[in-house]
């Protein structure tokens, strides 16, 4: 099919465009080149005749178009007016005619733009701005850029008039950038020139440096004030309301205690007609003062507060020494020193960060220290604990139990007997105690600062008789060469003595064997197989003596390394194989079976009814203990003979 | 306002010759193609032949090819159709008609009113 | 040359009608080269419509045209008194250009 291609689409006014004709026919009388999108003879180009090769201009020739024998068509130096369509009429050798359309744009070579602004010297928080791209040029994109970046998306930028303006509303000091516009078209791409945004701003509220109030007397007093602004802001100085000097320094030699007083720092712009003041106390000592310590928090809460601690005063050119427990500060995570070390930060207090805390100022000669300092961490309370510790008492005699909670505030104490209030006291006594007296007895702390409290609950028995004794044990299975068993005969009774026997024997002596807690607790290290016994607790006082019930000790062991019988190896064709594997193990192990690496069954016994000698090779069982985690095995070669065919050979089973 | 009107109507004797001339106004006449079509009496449309507006190149039908002679006179806004050794079969309205295209098109945008050749003896 | 064959030769309708004229060409033609005539006895003929489809300027929007090929379509969506005339088709794809015999359309 004939087609027309353009080269190029888009063309730049003054420059040139091939109209590139693809497909044509062969056997052709000529062709006519026409303007638009049809035949139109008002509207022809040029017409070329094949046979004598005449081009003839038709009414819209303007002397810049070129026709080839291809029947493309070259226009030069291309003017606006050329965009559009055009139409190749194709007369062929039969006086067929044949015709295609193609067509392309024409743009100006774009002028390099500038920007236009409505508003040279915008204020802060109160002007907008309008940058305008120049020239408006037709078929054009408007593009901006900010400090070589694309626009950022702001709700105070706003694009208009087809991108040409860009307006930022209510400007601030951080619109202060350069500013580019682009202009491009699809044959050329031009930026502007910088512009720079001058934002008129401020006085902000000036800063007095440097921010130390103390001086000495003697020194020189430099104060310089600074106040963000744009054009850069007037400064004045007034010491106690009296106007002292237009500068943004202030310098004072040698000054004495009568320099002491307000200063301040007033700044003014003189484009946005704002004044800003700033005031700061200055103190002059006629010698260096003693340093004391202040605190943010005088009563931290452990694990809770941060306690920030100041040495004052503040002093220009002055060295801050801190010292805990008179000692110097140590290497801590929880401790911070500011950059002028004048500000100690204890982050998330504990009870241990009492102190006490000193600090120092050094002058030339010496160190002024502070006087200390003591913090009152709240803390607590902690569970209390109830002492004595028994549980038995026999009756008549007196039962005095005494409660304490670590606390700051020191804890207020309260007694319950069987969850009935008994008295608000630390301490509580009974005289010539009797069965009645026997029950749950509670304490229970109170922190009034931090509204926390905190009990511990003890039973209590009053009897003549002994109770009966009862072992307990810290690890009821414990593993072969590994674990240590801890028994303890309960309960703890007042005036006992407390025996023990091992499968109905006194204890034997053993390294492994100790006795601890008034012979209360008997631990095993190292358990072994062994130690699987019955082990029995006693207790006796003068009057009574009782036994416990006998707790075995159930130790996990093995797998061992399993045996497989029979012990034949030799067997002769048509036997039964029944081989069974063992292994002494606690609890028992799983038994599997493999035959030549093949995994078989999950049993104890393999059994293979009349062997042959496709079944010589190796039987290997593997033993595993899930409780103790440990694995076995052993291997065993079997043959099969043929029948017959060597003597001494089991039958099987 | 495209106008084309046609003269040189008249009755001729078989074998001899007239001259149709079609003078045209309100385009650029030189600019385009021109043809002639004609009509036999109770028949259809039936073209004739064509020239072109800026290069001399002519189209005939194969019922007039070598009889009838087409030309025109750019200078002059006319359009001539010689036609020798005439036929009884040529007898019809003759009608002039403009081409859109400036090579011969084949497509008629404008046309006149017709004139009418007798050939009869 | 390519054969045009119109039909029917004669339409009677009445005006408000729908009136639709057929042409078929002996081979295929491209739609860009097929033109449709209106010709009225003692006047001259009238371009309506080109490229198969494409109104000639001044004509009415109840005339249009269709088809593709070898077959293409003249409608008259709803007939006027000055539609009844004879309507041709024509190509002027290759030479000679041919018209068809004519659609005769008269008022019933």
């Known amino acids: 099919k004939l087609t027309i291609e353009s080269t190029p689409f888009n063309v730049a006014e003054g420059k040139e465009v091939l109209l590139l004709v693809h497909n044509l026919p062969q056997h052709l009388f000529g062709y006519s080149w026409y303007k638009g999108e049809r035949v139109d003879g008002n509207r022809q180009i040029i017409g070329y005749v094949i046979g004598t090769q005449q081009a003839t201009p038709g009414p819209a020739y303007s002397g810049r178009e070129i026709i080839y024998p291809n029947a493309s068509l070259l226009i030069q130096n291309i003017i606006q007016n050329d965009t559009g369509f055009y139409t190749l009429h194709v007369i062929k050798s039969d006086l067929v005619n044949e015709e295609a359309t193609g067509q392309f744009r024409v743009y100006p070579e774009l002028p390099k733009p500038s920007i236009s602004s409505n508003n040279s010297k915008p204020v802060e928080d109160k002007d907008a701005v309008a940058f305008t791209c120049e020239p408006e040029t037709q078929d054009a994109t408007y593009l901006w850029w900010v400090n070589n970046q694309s626009l950022p998306v702001s709700p105070r930028l706003q694009l208009s008039n087809g991108n040409r303006t860009l307006t930022l509303f209510n400007v601030t000091r951080n619109d202060t950038a350069s500013y580019k516009c682009e202009t491009q078209n699809p044959v050329s791409a031009r930026r502007s020139d910088s512009v720079i945004l001058n934002v008129l701003y401020g006085p902000d509220a000036p800063t007095i440096s440097p921010l130390n109030t103390s001086y000495r007397s003697g020194e020189n007093l430099n104060l310089s004030c600074h106040a963000a602004s744009n054009p850069p802001a007037q400064y004045s100085w007034f010491v106690n309301g009296t106007f002292q000097q237009s500068t943004q320094e202030l310098f004072i030699p040698n000054i004495t205690v009568n320099n002491s007083g307000s200063y301040t720092c007033q700044a003014h712009n003189s484009d946005t007609g704002l004044n800003r003041t700033t005031v700061t106390t200055i103190t002059v000592y006629a010698e260096p003062p003693k340093p004391f310590i202040t605190s943010n928090n005088s009563n931290p809460v452990e694990d809770e507060d941060a306690v920030a601690l100041t040495c004052e005063p503040e002093i220009q050119n002055t060295t801050y020494l801190w010292w805990v427990n008179n000692q110097s500060l140590p290497v801590s995570p929880r401790l911070q020193l500011s950059n002028d070390n004048r500000t100690l930060t204890l982050l998330s207090v504990t009870r241990n960060d009492v102190g006490p805390y000193e600090c120092g100022i050094q002058n030339e000669l010496s160190v002024d220290h502070s006087d200390p300092v003591i913090l009152n961490v709240l803390y607590g309370p902690d569970d209390p604990t109830i002492s004595p510790s028994y549980t038995y008492y026999r009756p008549g005699v007196n039962l005095s139990l005494s409660c304490h909670a670590a606390s700051n505030p020191p804890a207020q104490y309260s007694w319950l007997i069987d969850g009935n209030i008994q008295q608000h006291t630390q301490e509580l006594f009974i005289s010539n105690i009797t069965e009645k007296n026997s029950g749950l007895y509670t304490c229970q702390a109170n922190n009034s600062a931090s509204g926390h409290s905190r009990t511990t609950v003890k039973t209590i028995t009053v009897s003549a008789e002994l109770p009966k004794p009862s072992i307990s044990s810290n690890n009821s299975k414990p593993v072969e060469d590994k674990d240590a068993v801890a028994f303890t005969c309960e309960p703890e009774a007042q005036n006992t003595t407390y025996l023990w026997w091992v499968n109905g024997q006194s204890l034997p002596v053993s390294p492994r064997l100790q006795l601890s807690n008034g012979n209360r607790t008997l631990t095993l290290f190292n358990v072994t197989r062994n130690d699987a016994r019955a082990y029995v607790c006693g207790i006796q006082n003068s009057v009574s003596a009782n036994r416990s019930d006998p707790v075995t000790l159930d130790v996990l062991y093995g797998p061992d390394t399993p045996i497989i019988s029979p012990p034949d190896s030799s067997y002769l064709s048509g036997a039964n194989l029944n081989l069974s594997c063992h292994s002494a193990s606690n609890p028992s192990p799983q038994y599997s079976w493999r035959i030549n690496g093949i995994p078989q069954q999950h049993t104890q016994v393999l059994f293979i009814a009349k062997i042959t000698p496709n079944n010589n090779g190796t039987y290997a069982c593997f033993v595993s203990n899930l409780a103790t985690g440990r694995n076995n095995s052993i291997v065993k070669s079997i043959t099969v003979s043929a029948s017959g065919t060597s003597p001494g050979l089991s039958a099987g089973a | 306002e495209v106008q084309l009107v046609e003269s040189g109507a008249g009755l001729v004797q078989p074998g001899g010759s007239l001259r149709l001339s079609c003078a045209a106004s309100?385009?650029?006449?030189?600019?385009?193609?021109m043809t002639w079509v004609r009509q036999a009496p109770g028949k259809g449309l039936e073209w004739v032949s064509a020239i072109s507006g800026s290069v001399d190149i002519t189209y005939y039908a194969d019922s007039v090819k070598g009889r009838f002679t087409i030309s025109r006179d750019n200078s002059k806004n006319t359009l001539y159709l010689q036609m020798n050794s005439l036929r009884a079969e040529d007898t019809a309205v003759y009608y002039c008609?403009?081409?859109?295209?400036?090579?011969?098109?084949?497509?008629?945008?404008?046309w006149g009113q017709g004139t009418l050749v007798t050939v009869s003896s | 040359e390519i054969v045009l064959t119109q039909s029917p030769g004669t339409l009677s309708l009445s005006p408000g009608e729908r009136a639709t004229l057929s042409c078929r060409a002996s081979q295929s033609i491209s739609s860009i080269y097929l033109a449709w005539y209106q010709h009225k006895p003692g006047q001259a003929p009238m371009l309506l419509i080109y490229?198969?489809?494409s109104r000639a300027t001044g004509i009415p929007d109840r005339f249009s045209g269709s088809g593709s090929g070898t077959d293409f379509t003249l409608t008259i969506s709803r007939l006027e008194p000055e539609d009844f005339a004879v309507y041709y088709c024509?190509?002027?794809?290759?030479?000679?250009?041919?018209f068809g015999q004519g659609t005769k359309l008269e008022i019933k």
């Open positions: 008609a403009k081409d859109r295209g400036n090579w011969n098109y084949g497509l008629f945008d404008y």
């Open positions: 309100g385009f650029t006449f030189s600019s385009y193609a």
């Open positions: 024509q190509q002027f794809g290759s030479s000679p250009w041919t």
């Open positions: 490229g198969a489809s």
